[in-house]
């Protein structure tokens, strides 16, 4: 069991683990969610996306959180639950970005450029909100990245 | 060989009670979710419940909530599924499914136990 | 609550491509599965993730899912495929399925 975004393999995630994590803080994420009107992962960013593309756009997306949105919050929460949570869902985006290796050859410059404009929707969506409420909408719109990621899980 | 096998369903008058069993085999059972789909007679598949590996997530279906209850005891690798205030609608074969993602991948199914709920 | 819409029946010649569609609001940002349904039996996977077969299913079951509408395709339908085929999808923390579809392989 593991995930093929196109050309890139990742393996040793287990899926479960990052719903558990997820859904152990969900509730506390959406309910503190007050934009409900706005979408981060709107329909743009993971609609159609190609194989080819997704192993550029998972990649940007993953650091994004991983170096804006869990490294942020977690200045910002104390709840040990929360924490611990957040440090699943981290350790395994850490796992899958580490795993990831995107190729930089020039006959693939339209397709990271595709990738770079979906995630630039997402980037720019983001940062249209103030900085707590941003952080809060990302965190609750995990489980629609779990869900797309879905899509290129093998059993 | 991965193995799934529903018990304890019944015959219930309305407004009884019962407790479904899945017992589960051939897989490390607390590393999925599982889930309770149920099929009405000459009916369509309708999802009823979902409990995460560690048990501590549960969902329902708007039709069981408040009249359901899912659990799991990972000790026995068993899956359970009360149910009270049982309706004449909520006769159907109940299925346990495996969820190989743990939200909604039901790559394998049990056979399924009868439940009737007639006066 | 999420809905996913199926043609109640489908009918397809021995040999030929049948094509059962799954219709959903923006259904081509959720992974899609589909099951294959024999009376008295269990449903069993034939597709996950839009397109990808599980190991022993035939060749000739193929998937996509794009924009509201998703599709299980069989290439060179045979007689042992005449069953019910259901889509399903996870949205907001449930699993929903559609209602259905009977192929009957003439």
């Known amino acids: 069991q593991e995930f093929h975004f196109g050309p890139c393999q990742v393996k040793g995630v287990v899926p479960q683990k990052l719903w558990e994590a997820f859904w152990a803080v969900k509730d506390t994420m959406q309910a503190q969610d007050n934009i409900t009107s706005a979408r981060l992962l709107q329909q743009e960013v993971l609609q159609n996306v190609s194989d080819a593309e997704s192993c550029y756009l998972v990649h940007t997306l993953l650091e994004f959180y991983l170096k804006t949105v869990f490294k942020n919050y977690h200045n910002r929460t104390v709840e040990v639950r929360t924490l611990k949570s957040f440090s699943t869902l981290a350790n395994n985006f850490v796992l899958i970005v580490s795993q990831l290796q995107p190729s930089q050859e020039n006959e693939m410059f339209s397709i990271r450029d595709s990738a770079h404009r979906r995630f630039l929707l997402f980037r720019r969506a983001f940062k249209q909100l103030d900085v707590e409420a941003a952080l809060t909408k990302a965190l609750g719109e995990v489980d629609i990245l779990l869900t797309w990621m879905q899509k290129f899980y093998k059993l | 060989q991965l193995q799934l096998v529903e018990s304890g369903g019944a015959l219930v008058q309305p407004g009884g009670s019962l407790r479904l069993s899945c017992a589960a085999s051939?897989?490390?059972?607390?590393?999925?979710?599982m889930s309770w789909v149920r099929q009405a007679p000459g009916k369509g598949l309708e999802w009823v419940s979902h409990i995460s590996g560690n048990g501590f997530s549960t969902f329902y279906a708007e039709s069981m909530k408040g009249r359901a209850t899912i659990s799991r005891d990972n000790a026995k690798n068993t899956l359970y599924l009360q149910m009270n205030s049982l309706k004449s609608e909520d006769t159907a074969v109940y299925y346990c499914a495996k969820d190989d993602y743990g939200s909604g991948l039901y790559a394998y199914w049990g056979q399924g136990t009868q439940v009737t709920v007639s006066s | 609550s999420y809905e996913l819409t199926q043609s109640p029946s489908v009918s397809v010649a021995l040999k030929q491509t049948a094509k059962i569609t799954c219709g959903g609001d923006?259904?081509?940002?959720?992974?899609a599965q589909w099951y294959q349904q024999k009376p008295g039996q269990a449903p069993v996977l034939v597709i996950y993730?839009?397109?990808r077969r599980p190991s022993g299913i035939p060749e000739r079951f193929s998937g996509s899912n794009s924009g509201n509408t998703a599709t299980l395709t069989i290439s060179g339908a045979q007689a042992e495929d005449e069953a019910d085929y259901y889509c399903q999808v996870w949205d907001s923390s449930a699993a929903v399925f559609g209602g259905g579809t009977h192929l009957t392989v003439l």
């Open positions: 993730a839009d397109s």
């Open positions: 923006n259904i081509g940002s959720k992974s």
């Open positions: 051939g897989f490390t059972f607390d590393d999925y979710a």
